[in-house]
Each structure stands twice: as structure tokens, then as C-alpha cells.
């Protein structure tokens, strides 16, 4: 004979556990229904009545099956140096990512607390290591025979053109100038652009209790210029 299906709330077998999407209520000592994502427990179960769920209130969410008394508060609106890649809904928190040209300078347990602008290497310096979603650009001085005449977070040092007859010798921030005969290059011509990092890292603020209980709001710190380093500019 098939086992009888138990409807919540029910007392579990001694040493047994509750089924999927159920939880054991210590007060009622019963297996009770969890609430689905986007809802929370409005009334907890008793020995004779199951959990009563209700929709999350505006600007709050639950992402998992749960029995929390209040939904979690969505993070603050994204700051001006960020883009909202996921809106706050009843089932998910807002996700903000650093916009192109920025990186996450101060991480936290979930996401990013502070975006900062990618360092730009000034003339005479090129990109040694490109920026990523979580690390800044590293600049290096252009080695002899190479130059960079731009202020850029993507340009590397390029080789001087090789002249049959040099009019003006090149330096770290300027290409060589040849006399009218055609120059050649020691390597491939043209500026080499490193791709901008694509921010995909989740940066939602830490979930905090919904406003009706204790509304702890996470804030994004104000963005200052990136710390100066050799060969970089704050522009």
C-alpha cells in the first residue's frame, strides 16, 4: 500500500526530517510549509494551521524558499559610477556593476562597496597590466626604443618607427621623426589597444532587514580619484 501523503502541518517521524520546501517549527513541533521566493512568513504555523505567506513589501525581496518574518531590503539605488544590471524585484536584490572605465576598488562579502576610475597612463608610460573588474591598471615607463604619447588606460608602449635617416630621435613620449624617405617599424604598426574590462561581478549591497523591523541601509562610499602612482594621472 502507498504511504499516506502528509499535509502540512504534520509531526515528523521520530528522528525524521521535513520534506523539501518545508521546515521544522520548534514552537509548534511540526513540519510546516516554507514560503516561496518573493514572499515571507506573515503568520507562523501552529499545530493546526500552516504558515501564512505574504508578498514582499515594496523594495524588499526573498530569493529562496524561506520562513523569514520580513523580506530583506534591496540595496540602495546604484551610484552614478555604476550601472544597474539587475533591478530590485520581489525575488532578487538590485545588482550594480562598475561602469566601463571603472573597477571595484573596495570589495565586500557580496559585490562591491566602491567603484574607482581606472588609472590612465600618462605620456611616456604604457599599460603593463590592464585593468580588470577588480583591479586597477598598472603603468610602466616605456623602455628604450618604445613610446606612448597618449593618456590612456588601454594603450601600451609602441616601438619607435625605424628611419633610414632620423630627423628627430624618439623618446619615451614621442615617436621618432624621419626625413622624407619611408620609415619602417620594428614591430606591427599602430597603437595597440587593450580591451576595457567587462564588469560582470555582482555588486549588490548586503541584505539588510526590511524597514518595518530594523532598516539598516548599506551605503556606497563617495568616489574619489584613484590613488596616484608613478606614470599615472588622476584624469
Amino acid at each position: 500500500l502507498p504511504a499516506q501523503v502528509a499535509f502540512t502541518p504534520y509531526a515528523p517521524e521520530p528522528g525524521g526530517t521535513c520534506r523539501l520546501r518545508e521546515y521544522y517549527d520548534q514552537t509548534a513541533q511540526m513540519c510546516c510549509s516554507k514560503c516561496p521566493p518573493g514572499q515571507h512568513a506573515k503568520v507562523f504555523c501552529t499545530k493546526t494551521s500552516d504558515t501564512v505567506c505574504d508578498s514582499c513589501e515594496d523594495s524588499t525581496y526573498t530569493q529562496l524558499w524561506n520562513w523569514v518574518p520580513e523580506c530583506l531590503s534591496c540595496g540602495s539605488r546604484c551610484s552614478s559610477d555604476q550601472v544597474e544590471t539587475q533591478a530590485c524585484t520581489r525575488e532578487q536584490n538590485r545588482i550594480c556593476t562598475c561602469r566601463p572605465g571603472w573597477y571595484c576598488a573596495l570589495s565586500k562579502q557580496e559585490g562591491c562597496r566602491l567603484c574607482a576610475q581606472l588609472r590612465k597612463c600618462r605620456p611616456g608610460f604604457g599599460v603593463a597590466r590592464p585593468g580588470t573588474e577588480t583591479s586597477d591598471v598598472v603603468c610602466k615607463p616605456c623602455a628604450p626604443g618604445t613610446f606612448s604619447n597618449t593618456t590612456s588606460s588601454t594603450d601600451i608602449c609602441r616601438p619607435h618607427q625605424i628611419c633610414h635617416v632620423v630627423a628627430i630621435p624618439g623618446n619615451a613620449s614621442m615617436d621618432a621623426v624621419c626625413t622624407s624617405t619611408s620609415p619602417t617599424r620594428s614591430m606591427a604598426p599602430g597603437a595597440v589597444h587593450l580591451p576595457q574590462p567587462v564588469s560582470t561581478r555582482s555588486q549588490h549591497t548586503q541584505p539588510t532587514p526590511a524597514p518595518s523591523t530594523a532598516p539598516g541601509t548599506s551605503f556606497l562610499l563617495p568616489v574619489g580619484p584613484s590613488p596616484p602612482a608613478e606614470g599615472s594621472t588622476g584624469d
Epitope: 515594496d58 523594495s59 534591496c74 541601509t217
Partner: antibody
């Protein structure tokens, strides 16, 4: 563009009812709340209640719980405010306003207002 | 209910003046849930500042907001002719959601 267009002015006698409409256009009605705010002549703003058009769930200021009925018809993107047992003190401009879910209740678009005058 | 008290109730100022309006809540309000509206005579209110300090697109940068807990401030750094209006703070922290009584900014 986003627009909330309300029905025209109403002149009603005490004890009567009135139904004000607010037609929304230019946005998806799904992830918003529609609020009703009233403003008596020369007075400030008073929040009456709000409706989630997607579910029909409503929330009122207890002061208006028995006075105002909020409803919506998503097929015509319209929210309604019905006020019953009108008294002279219900004379006011009634505004509808929307707040997107997740924007912490900021009412970013408002209707032009509907003047309801209650006089015998 | 959370009571929102604005001060002053009205003020007279000249074009170019710096104007500050305060809003005091009877109990703590999360910064995300505090907004300011501007209303001109015969017109619907307009969202001026959301979540204490954020400006919607199209709102001039002379408007700014600050505060936390129970005390919030709206500042107009240099009053312009089009800024003469009534300003309301609004809390959405706890239902019923409430407005301040308004501050009328008049021409001196």
C-alpha cells in the same frame, strides 16, 4: 513617454459617491504601485492608499480604510479611486501617482489631479 | 504613524539666496525611504529628490538633500525664480506613508 491622465472634475452632493480614474501609458503596469494622494484647498498632501495593479493588493491609511476603495483594470491600464459617503470636507484635488517597485516609494510621475467638490 | 514636521512653514527669500528646509521625523526613517517633492500652484507635485540625496534626471544640481535618522535637509544653493513653490518631505519607511505639512518659499 510616461503619462498618468485622470478623469475630469466632479461636483457631488453630500452622501453621494464618486469614482475617479487614472489611465496610465508609456510603461509596464507590472512592477509599479499606484498611489492616491489628496490635497484639500490650501492644505498639504495626504497619502490615502495604494494598489499593486498586478495583484490587486491594496494598502490604506486607516483613516481612509472605510472611505476609499482602490481598484484597477490592467486590460485598460487604469486605476480607480472610489470615495463613498461624501462630505463637504472631502472636497479636494485627488492625485494618482506611481512608484516603481524597488525605488523605495519615490513617486516619480503624477496625474494632473481631479477636483472633487462636495456641496449641497 | 510617523509624523513629518517641516520647518519653517514658510520663508521669504530673494533670487540667489541659499535656502535650507528641514524635515524632522517622529521616529527614525531609513535614508532610502525619504523623498522630497516640489509643487507649484495649480500643478501636481514633482519628485525633486529621492532617497535623501539623489536627483532625478532633469532636476538642477542647485538642489541637494542630506540627513539620516530623524533629521533631513533640502538645500537650494542659489534660489532661481522658478524655485518659488511649496516643498514637501515624504517618508515611505512605515505605513501609513506620510508627508510633511509643506514649506512655502515666497519671493521677498
Amino acid at each position: 513617454q510616461v503619462q498618468l491622465v485622470q478623469s475630469g472634475s466632479e461636483l457631488k452632493k453630500p452622501g453621494a459617491s464618486v469614482k475617479v480614474s487614472c489611465k496610465a501609458s508609456g510603461f509596464n503596469n507590472k512592477d509599479i504601485y499606484m498611489h492616491w494622494v489628496r490635497q484639500a484647498p490650501g492644505q498639504g498632501l495626504e497619502w490615502m492608499g495604494r494598489i499593486d495593479p498586478a495583484t490587486g493588493n491594496t494598502k490604506h491609511d486607516p483613516k481612509f480604510q472605510d472611505k476609499a476603495v482602490l481598484s484597477s483594470d490592467t486590460s485598460v491600464s487604469t486605476a480607480y479611486l472610489q470615495i463613498s459617503s461624501l462630505k463637504a470636507e472631502d472636497t479636494a484635488v485627488y492625485y494618482c501617482a506611481r512608484s516603481p517597485y524597488g525605488d523605495f516609494g519615490a513617486m516619480d510621475y503624477w496625474g494632473q489631479g481631479t477636483l472633487v467638490t462636495v456641496s449641497s | 504613524d510617523i509624523q513629518m514636521t517641516q520647518s519653517p512653514s514658510s520663508l521669504s527669500a530673494s533670487v540667489g539666496d541659499r535656502v535650507t528646509i528641514t524635515c524632522t521625523a517622529s521616529s527614525s526613517v531609513s535614508s532610502n525611504y525619504l523623498h522630497w517633492y516640489q509643487q507649484k500652484p495649480g500643478k501636481a507635485p514633482k519628485l525633486l529628490i529621492y532617497s535623501t540625496s539623489n536627483l532625478p534626471s532633469g532636476v538642477p544640481s542647485r538642489f541637494s538633500g542630506s540627513g539620516s535618522g530623524t533629521d533631513f535637509t533640502l538645500t537650494i544653493s542659489s534660489l532661481q525664480p522658478e524655485d518659488f513653490a511649496t516643498y514637501y518631505c515624504h517618508q515611505y519607511h512605515r505605513s501609513p506613508w506620510t508627508f510633511g505639512q509643506g514649506t512655502k518659499v515666497e519671493i521677498k
